[in-house]
Amino acid sequence: KNLKSPQKVEVDIIDDNFILRWNRSDESVGNVTFSFDYQKTGMDNWIKLSGCQNITSTKCNFSSLKLNVYEEIKLRIRAEKENTSSWYEVDSFTPFRKAQIGPPEVHLEAEDKAIVIHISPGTKDSVMWALDGLSFTYSLVIWKNSSGVEERIENIYSRHKIYKLSPETTYCLKVKAALLTSWKIGVYSPVHCIKTTVENELPPPENIEVSVQNQNYVLKWDYTYANMTFQVQWLHAFLKRNPGNHLYKWKQIPDCENVKTTQCVFPQNVFQKGIYLLRVQASDGNNTSFWSEEIKFDTEIQAFLLPPVFNIRSLSDSFHIYIGAPKQSGNTPVIQDYPLIYEIIFWENTSNAERKIIEKKTDVTVPNLKPLTVYCVKARAHTMDEKLNKSSVFSDAVCEKTKPGNTSK
């Protein structure tokens, strides 16, 4: 009896695992084995596919074959008993195009109100993703074990910290990888659960902000208790993206070690151009808080977002304000690379009632003023980019008297 060729061959590639599955064409024939050949693009000869010769089941693994994952290959299969079936040819495919991203590895650490998630590619030193290692982004779904209400967090990297959680609560999460450059979305990891600890005696510092004054950065934060000491650390933001590395070498800011105030000042030259993460920790000598939320700090934006410089031309019922580029030391103007919005606040010198104008233009009219009255003006700049969402500090207030009535020039 002629053996029939196997049918419905499926190629499943997850990371570096190459699996073939097929259907027997004739269930009634026993003791049949199956063998595969492969052919690379531009070759005429067929080569035996190691790992997939004389297989008795309907599944085989050819992961050991060292293929160029970007090169198209063709497969063929036949059934064998005393005689052999004809070859059944599988549509040619490119492994990289066909490959799915496997579930990532997840490692969790718990604090009282935060969880640190470390994510690694499921296959270490993967050949399939060798050129894409740094391009992986991850997304996760997290929920309280008790409620099941899910929250999704997109576009995270190999280390992510989730804050504002409840103490002594079990949270569960699952993570999947994506290679957006190749339009690939991966498979979710198994569910991992961890319980946050009892509430710590000392809360972490909050509301960390960086501003620029002269040639210095000023870092400020809020804290609940007095008589504390604080330390500040920084990390290059790109290190969160390094897939295999889960040793984060946070560095001390020397001028912000054991400070007794809720701010510290350090020279701008501490940081080269780049994006950094900053965090603050509090201590009362006996106990230490967990680290604060990590804030992103971009030196380019921070440096350029100096308060605006402006001139006032006074009329009887209005001010004309002309905004110029802020000056660095040495009176050289700073070049603003980012589109800015200006917030102008003005008030009558004898009153506390402030009025606000938001303007994109650099020449602004402040209307409806009283003649011969002293008004004060201060301004600050905001980036228009939602992601960056930075603001300069306010400029020093400038006070001017409006002209007598009926002056329009």
């Epitope: 490692h107 969790l108 650490e109 718990a110 604090e111 009282d112 470390h118 961890i194 600890t197 009892v198 710590n200 005696e201 590395n245 889960h246 040793l247 070498k249 560095k251 001390q252 006996n286 106990n287 230490t288 967990f290």
Partner: antibody
């Protein structure tokens, strides 16, 4: 294969100094933290300090500040522990340890025995 | 400094038994705790890290649990080769600190 090869046992006079070395193979010390840990006979483990060989930044237990100095030579993939003004309290085995992912002390040298004689 | 207290200096157990070694931190250290095993005449080896993760190659009879201030290393089905001293260590804050150790003796 990751290995930490420590220098041989030392017998030194009280008041003198000693420099212990630890040569790493199978990895680049710049990518890790390198720690030194002290263990006295029948006693527990005591962390002395660590270095980030990438930039030389060090951290010490306050009681070892001034007593111990940790340095690194990235060209030879070697870390050093200098101990000075030695007393009998410094008689111990000193371990060189790699600080790896998740800050775990994942590889330990074989230990160097230091005996301080009066 | 954070003090790690291992109240039991010695623990006696039999092959096949289950034994739990405990460690208490003087303040909340999250799950930033590791356990090390030191066999007689050898260097210590990491067994558990991040409170509950088994290090590569460590048999699954070793499990770690706990968070905050209370931590436990459990060895189920104790084997003769588990005769060793076990140390806990916190790495939440500098200076890093170890417990004083618990010696496991096998009857």
């Amino acid at each position: 294969e990751v290995q930490l090869q420590q220098s041989g046992a030392e017998l030194v006079k009280s008041g003198a100094s000693v420099r212990l070395s630890c040569t790493a193979s199978g990895f680049n010390i710049k990518d890790y933290y390198m720690h030194w840990v002290k263990q006295r006979t029948e006693k527990g483990l005591e962390w002395i300090g660590r270095i980030d060989p990438e930039d030389g930044e060090t951290k010490y237990v306050p009681k070892f500040q001034g007593k111990a100095t940790i340095t690194a030579d990235t060209s030879s993939n070697t870390v050093y522990l200098q101990l000075n003004s030695l007393t009998s309290e410094d008689t111990a085995v000193y371990y060189c340890v790699r600080g790896g992912n998740y800050y775990v002390m994942d590889y330990w040298g074989q230990g160097t025995s230091v005996t301080v004689s009066s | 400094d954070i003090v790690m207290t291992q109240s039991q200096k010695f623990m006696s157990t039999s092959v096949g038994d289950r034994v739990s070694v405990t460690c208490k931190a003087s303040q909340n250290v999250g799950t930033y705790v590791a356990w090390y095993q030191q066999k007689p005449g050898q260097s210590p080896k990491v067994v558990i890290y991040s409170a509950s993760y088994r290090y590569n190659g460590v048999p699954d009879r070793f499990t770690g649990s706990g968070s905050g201030t209370d931590f436990t290393l459990t060895i189920s089905n104790v084997q003769p080769e588990d005769l060793a001293e076990y140390f806990c260590q916190q790495y939440n804050n500098y200076p890093l600190t170890f417990g004083s150790g618990t010696k496991l003796e096998i009857k």
